[in-house]
Amino acid sequence: IVGGQEAPRSKWPWQVSLRVHGPYWMHFCGGSLIHPQWVLTAAHCVGPDVKDLAALRVQLREQHLYYQDQLLPVSRIIVHPQFYTAQIGADIALLELEEPVNVSSHVHTVTLPPASETFPPGMPCWVTGWGDVDNDERLPPPFPLKQVKVPIMENHICDAKYHLGAYTGDDVRIVRDDMLCAGNTRRDSCQGDSGGPLVCKVNGTWLQAGVVSWGEGCAQPNRPGIYTRVTYYLDWIHHYVPKKP
């Protein structure tokens, strides 16, 4: 997370850390708890070549990475069938946990938005994660969860910005309909935040608007952060994840 600050302990109870096996269980992406047994993340975190179930664990909301790990096993990794690269879209995936999480005030699910929600500019939105704090600058110990408030940008404006200084023709969309843009040169998500949630407060409820997906650098001029637009994939999500009763 570029800019922003350490998150208060009481906030973002749906935030999770994805861990890969190595010399230690290393954080590599974020995710969000959308059901007691399901985590939403980015497809590029776990695909297109899907890792072994044995190589992956989920850590629930933790103030400082690694300090009180209770890693959870995953029983299924579901990558969106249309995913190939983040830039093309469909950068969304689901992880099913072997056992449902015991929800509490500290750990609980985030609400998915209604299909009609557009998340217009001016809406109060935040992105969270344990990723880099600037380009090629790692989050330092004790690895606190960070938060930053990011401004939403309309897709057509974001697409026009991404065409500045790019070789892509103006008639070729860079920012697609299944994407959402947010951030500026002082506030952005970054490497290691991928898969994590972009949430917006709508009528008093935090809704997950996006999944950290891609961008050219972090907090670069004319290059806002790009997120997978959750509303675009609600039907796909609910094909697997039970709706709340």
Epitope: Q37, D52, L53, A54, A55, E96, E98, E99, P100
Partner: antibody, heavy 119, light 106 residues
């Protein structure tokens, strides 16, 4: 001592049913995913089914889906395999195994129980 | 479903020989697991996460590989190594084992 002891095997007619049990001791049974693996006479190992620590997740080999049911009773430290509509090709030694907590290999195996399906 | 193919199905070797068993997965996996089984006995865990030796396994055993191709190697075969070895993946369900490789005395 960490131990798994299977029981319930025997001779059963085709189309019949059998329930295998596996008694666990020497470890906190409720912390571990458990697996059944079988081995037909003179053949290799075949994975049968998996159950997660709290029974929320179960998976079966395709040939056993719909006929076999894996379950567990954590209060009794016991794993079960209910086998229905048995066929001659289900004849095998059935092993109960524990999935290692950290590394996902099958680190503890029972001695096995022989199931013979024959008329 | 991922299929596992071991080769050879059986091999004859002498004490002191270097022995290599291969296991090929039908699609890419991260890790391979190996088990040893002797006649009339339950299988024993032998190698996990491709190259880590299970408790009590002698250092003459090693495991390697990535993607779809993995190997178990015995640098100098000993009398107690004559057994059948099985590979297994833990990529996704259903889990599958290789058909086994029987190591026999020449």
């Amino acid at each position: 001592e960490v131990q798994l002891v299977e029981s319930g095997g025997g001779l059963v007619q085709p189309g019949g049913s059998l329930r295998l049990s596996c008694a666990a001791s020497g470890f906190t049974f409720s912390d571990y995913g458990m697996v059944w693996v079988r081995q037909a006479p003179g053949k290799g190992l075949e994975w049968v089914a998996f159950i997660s620590s709290g029974s929320s997740t179960v998976y079966y080999a395709d040939t056993m889906k719909g006929r076999f049911t894996i379950s567990r009773d954590n209060s009794k430290n016991t794993l079960y395999l209910q086998m229905n509509s048995l066929r001659a090709e289900d004849t095998a030694v059935y092993y109960c195994t524990r999935r290692n907590y950290d590394d996902r290999y099958f680190d503890v195996w029972g001695q096995g129980t022989l199931v013979t399906v024959s008329s | 479903d991922i299929q596992m193919t071991q080769s050879p199905s059986s091999l004859s070797a002498s004490v002191g020989d270097r022995v290599t068993i291969t296991c090929s997965a039908s699609s890419s996996v991260t890790y391979m697991y190996w088990y040893q089984q002797k006649p009339g006995k339950s299988p024993k865990p032998w190698i996990y996460r491709t190259s880590d030796l299970a408790s009590g396994v002698p250092s003459r055993f090693s495991g390697s590989g990535s993607g779809t191709d993995f190997t178990l190697t015995i640098s100098s075969l000993q009398p107690e190594d004559f057994a059948t070895y099985y590979c297994q993946h833990y990529h996704s369900y259903p889990l599958t084992f290789g058909q086994g490789t029987k190591v026999e005395i020449k």
